[in-house]
Amino acid sequence: MWELEKDVYVVEVDWTPDAPGETVNLTCDTPEEDDITWTSDQRHGVIGSGKTLTITVKEFLDAGQYTCHKGGETLSHSHLLLHKKENGIWSTEILKNFKNKTFLKCEAPNYSGRFTCSWLVQRNMDLKFNIKSSSSSPDSRAVTCGMASLSAEKVTLDQRDYEKYSVSCQEDVTCPTAEETLPIELALEARQQNKYENYSTSFFIRDIIKPDPPKNLQMKPLKNSQVEVSWEYPDSWSTPHSYFSLKFFVRIQRKKEKMKETEEGCNQKGAFLVEKTSTEVQCKGGNVCVQAQDRYYNSSCSKWACVPCRVRS
Amino acid sequence: RAVPGGSSPAWAQCQQLSQKLCTLAWSAHPLVGHMDLREEGDEETTNDVPHIQCGDGCDPQGLRDNSQFCLQRIRQGLIFYEKLLGSDIFTGEPSLLPDSPVGQLHASLLGLSQLLQPEGHHWETQQIPSPSPSQPWQRLLLRFKILRSLQAFVAVAARVFAHGAATLSP
């Protein structure tokens, strides 16, 4: 058993049917010695007496809030959370994994050291999250994260809707122009009722870069059905742009065609590569769509920015 | 070609070649996170790789002040990787076909490092470690690690040359 925060303890339990359970000693935080009784929010009536209560924890009924009393007065509380281990593997039941098998998905719109991580939950009830740097070595990268918040968007996976939580983090000391040598390491602690789980992720900022879409897409008519399409770097992208350059993929989207945001990289069929911020295209109905990607490192592509082909004359 | 002393390299040529290096490095190992290579035993070969760090003057301001520190660092790295790509790590099994991007990558690393070598001026180069893993498994793992590391290195180098070509070319 270990202390998660004041008066909250995590009991690591072997979740196999014949496991003996964990023996836990709870000590009442009081100078008093006599006439102390114990209750649990999971069971009726008095469950023990004495300054120290010894219990065996093997199921969720054994978790929860334990309170010691004397003569009708509450002396102290100890909250027990269960961390299940089945066949040597810690449980991962609170979160739902994304398509690529990861539980935490982090993205950064630039190289500033600011990034956002998100995760999906199976049931949005009685949840608490805490995310922090997981590496304690002196040369590790320190990160400060805010509070997790529930996103407005729901995510559908395998025909089921999941709630999405997000958190913003910032690396304490950054050097956007350097080559990263140590990954950022994060741990997410998740609590749901009396269940505790932890999840971890490790990444370089360069691998989680996903630029915002190009902005200010515009059309200028040329001869025949040729148009010049132009755009600008997204505001959030690192500067100077002569150093932090983007490349762009341009595609004609036919009417009624959906633009797929693929996991498998940017260069979809029919898209062509442009390094400047304008190009000429043949455009007869539908949309012209542009997406951005770091010019020198193949991290994720931005979402598509699209503009209709018809040009107001 | 770069000229002696503290003068500038051919920024535009370096930009082109470094961008080609980026493309080749990704062709040689396109899969991001295809195995979590950080989990595997850290080989000294990948630990000793020269990195472009914060104090190396490869940021826009540092390049404006004196690009030589940064260029020297980049050249050291290019020579290091060029030696690795020519070693048994890449010539042994698993077999690479002659059309492999690794061959072109190897030649381009050499080409760019020569562009950065001032006439009659030889920067000291780092000692290249030469552990030769005996098993295909270890060799392949090391290959992937080296290529992932090279992708990060040449991305920074390409940014440096792009910025130099845009702002420091005569």
């Epitope: - | 195995m35 099994e93 077999s95 076909l97 002659p98």
Partner: antibody, heavy 120, light 107 residues
Framework: QVQLVQSGAEVKKPGSSVKVSCKAS????????IHWMRQAPGQGLEWIGY????????KYNENFKGKVTITADKSTSTAYMELSSLRSEDTAVYYC?????????????WGQGTLVTVSS | DIQMTQSPSSLSASVGDRVTITCKAS??????VAWYQQKPGKVPKLLIY???TRHTGVPSRFSGSGSRTDFTLTISSLQPEDVADYFC?????????FGSGTKLEIK
Amino acid sequence: QVQLVQSGAEVKKPGSSVKVSCKASGYTFTDQTIHWMRQAPGQGLEWIGYIYPRDDSPKYNENFKGKVTITADKSTSTAYMELSSLRSEDTAVYYCAIPDRSGYAWFIYWGQGTLVTVSS
Amino acid sequence: DIQMTQSPSSLSASVGDRVTITCKASRDVAIAVAWYQQKPGKVPKLLIYWASTRHTGVPSRFSGSGSRTDFTLTISSLQPEDVADYFCHQYSSYPFTFGSGTKLEIK
């Protein structure tokens, strides 16, 4: 898109030779190796060898040395595989294929196959 | 030459079944193994490379695993269109070699 089109089926007498062609399109012919495999009726696949058209250098499976000659014609983007001193055991479907661009020999694109039958 | 010993040589399973085909290399090939599907009268089609990476467009019911000498192709839920021959292939060492194949049929 990448396409490999092979020549038609052949029936040959024992002791004779056959030359199978594989015309490539949809990519730069000199950029990639072209490999040849064979599959005898009801059997698995055997790798015969490859040619790298950029420098016309072939590499053979030792088991086929002296039996097979692989060549390439850059002007027509065509690879050839010639089998000599044919025997009944050479009856098989012969495939040309090109591998992935990363330089490892897993095969993404295959020709449609050419059946060579050796019979007296 | 590296021998790729594939088993079983044939198997019959019902739609929805989980099907496993194994391949054993006679020496270490790292993860330089690919799997192909060949339907009757058709050319082989790449399913898996690097032992476990699915090729573009291959349904997610196909998965590969293994390293060094022992490799597995798994079809998590057999579909009627999966009737075919399946081959493993090592591309670690010359000459590249293939398994003898597994003929998969529906019961």
